[in-house]
Amino acid sequence: IWELEKDVYVVELDWHPDAPGEMVVLTCHTPEEDDITWTSAQSSEVLGSGKTLTIQVKEFGDAGQYTCHKGGKVLSRSLLLIHKKEDGIWSTDILKEQKESKNKIFLKCEAKNYSGRFTCWWLTAISTDLKFSVKSSRGFSDPQGVTCGAVTLSAERVRVDNRDYKKYTVECQEGSACPSAEESLPIEVVVDAIHKLKYENYTSSFFIRDIIKPDPPTNLQLKPLKNSRHVEVSWEYPDTWSTPHSYFSLTFCIQAQGKNNREKKDRLCVDKTSAKVVCHKDAKIRVQARDRYYSSSWSDWASVSCS
Amino acid sequence: RAVPEGSSPAWIQGQQLSQKLCTLVWSAHPPMGHVDLPREEGDGETTSDVPRIQCGDGCDPQGLKDNSQFCLQRIHQGLVFYEKLLGSDIFTGEPSLLPDGPVGQLHANLLGLRQLLQPEGHHWETEQTPSPSPSQPWQRLLLRLKILRSLQAFVAVAARVFAHGAATLSP
């Protein structure tokens, strides 16, 4: 058993029929010595008396809030949560696994630039009695500060396998980020999730360089070229990208896309912010960006219509 | 010093070589999405001791403008280190790699960039030298991946430095 926050305790349980329950001794935080009684949120009936109450936590029915009283006055409260371990693996019932690799990923994080600011998100099918808190640091053994804001429920609903999921996001900022340095310690993100009386935690470990995903290029424009089916397509670096661009350079890929998003032509990739391409009527030109020197994620596409 | 007295670094050549290095290091070990290579005790011997480009090394745009020598010396140290690693038993031992494959080309290009930074007769002190390599082929494979991932991060910073130097500091 360990303390998650003041008066909130997590009981780690081996979730197996043959496993014994966990013995928990609750102490009433009071100078009083006599006439102390205990009740639980489950029951107003007296569960015991004295300064301590020894309970067995084996099921969710044993978790919850335990309160000690004297003469009708509440002296202190202890909330017990359960963290299940099944076959040696901590439960992951609250969040939806995001199937995008061989590893089990529950938290996804992205950064728009090298400033040390990043956003993480996760999915859950649960809509009530849910609480999240996020902690982050650079490195584990000698952690350096990363500050995370409040967790927010996104307006976006994500549909996976014919089921709706809610998307939660959090933004974090490294305290003393150094955009030009080579990262040696990863950022660690820990999300504590509580659903009713179930506690779970989820972690993600990454270098900012690996989660970079630039915003799409901006100000995408077409300029017809005289006596030619070609056009000059030009764009700009996204406003959110790190500066100076001579140092934090992007590379761009351009693609012509036919009607109904069909017949995607070969991609043309350039380091400049313009290119000559063939532009058929009813087609679209789209451009995406990626860090020029490190193969992180491509941005989403920015597109412009040929007509 | 990085280059003979009185002459400025060959930023444009450095830009071309470092960008080529970026291409090669990613073809030697393509992006793998979310893959956590296990961090074991003893990793430290070869991948934690790499000379990384850190915040105080002057490799940021302002630091390069003030005095690019600090940064170039740091890049040089890294190049020497990785060059030795790529020439060591970790990469030459079993399972063997094609001599003209991406790792072989990478090794040659590291040498090219290092020589650009340190022409014959001009010597910088080099700090670390890689430790002995593991004996098991599977350990070697894992270590290769870790070294290449670390090199990807290193050459990205080096390429930014040369690109910025070429754009803003070359005569």
Epitope: P17, D18, A19, P20, G21, M23, S40, A41, Q42, S43, E45, L47, L53, T54, I55, Q56, V57, K58, E59, F60, G61, D62, G64, Y66 | -
Partner: antibody, heavy 119, light 107 residues
Framework: EVQLVQSGAEVKKPGASVKVSCKGS????????LGWVRQAPGAGLDWMGI????????RYSPSFQGQVTMSVDTSTSTAYMELSSLRAGDIAVYYC????????????WGQGTLVTVSS | DIVMTQTPLSLSVSPGEPASISCRAS??????LAWYQQKAEKAPKSLIY???SLQSGVPDRFSGSGSGTDFTLRIGRVEAEDAGIYYC?????????FGQGTRLEVR
């Protein structure tokens, strides 16, 4: 006052099923797990299993697994225990009992339901 | 399954005399043991839980002790109404199991 009131005695043919009910009152029904105990004539007590009324989480005894089904209707504060493939060896009094939170014992018991199996 | 063994299987005590029943578990169960009393044709009634805690409303002539594998139920001064069968039950590991019962006769 805490009360667990069980349904009346049943007589069933071999191979049939029986469903015994247990209605809880005088306490918050959904927050206490409920269990079932069997007592054959002149014999001791046999723990059959327990279930959570809030989410129907169930722990069956291996001796009864496959033959017994526990269920609950929270709208009427009633728990059910269904025993299938009845045979003479299932003749017994079946008790429902309330599990004490923070412990695992039964602090209140129903009056019992006698199930007789006879052709 | 954990086997609970009670001794003796029956005892006869005069009113005002003490009585004691033992219960042994086939493996350690910490202090997760309960005692129940069952009178003829009635449902069992909880007496003691957590090896030594008295259930609310139970006379204090009843007491329990022990931990691990060996437990005892004591009745300080037996009264006529204490006649019945007494069962111990472990609730440490599923399936929770009962002892075979001890019949107490009050002479």
């Amino acid at each position: 006052e805490v009360q667990l009131v069980q349904s009346g005695a049943e007589v069933k043919k071999p191979g049939a099923s029986v469903k015994v009910s247990c209605k809880g009152s005088g306490y918050s029904f959904t927050t206490y797990w409920l269990g079932w105990v069997r007592q054959a004539p002149g014999a001791g007590l046999d723990w059959m299993g327990i279930m959570s009324p809030v989410d129907s989480d169930i722990r069956y005894s291996p001796s009864f697994q496959g033959q017994v089904t526990m269920s609950v209707d929270t709208s009427t504060s009633t728990a059910y225990m269904e025993l299938s493939s009845l045979r003479a060896g299932d003749i017994a009094v079946y008790y429902c009992a309330r599990r004490r939170p923070g412990q695992g014992y039964f602090d209140f018991w129903g009056q019992g339901t006698l199930v007789t199996v006879s052709s | 399954d954990i086997v609970m063994t009670q001794t003796p299987l029956s005892l006869s005590v005069s009113p005002g005399e003490p009585a004691s029943i033992s219960c042994r578990a086939s493996q350690g169960i910490s202090s997760w043991l309960a005692w129940y009393q069952q009178k003829a044709e009635k449902a069992p009634k909880s007496l003691i839980y957590a090896a030594s805690s008295l259930q609310s409303g139970v006379p204090d002539r009843f007491s329990g002790s022990g931990s691990g594998t060996d437990f005892t139920l004591r009745i300080g001064r037996v009264e006529a109404e204490d006649a019945g069968i007494y069962y111990c039950q472990q609730y440490n590991i599923y399936p929770y199991t009962f002892g075979q019962g001890t019949r107490l006769e009050v002479r």
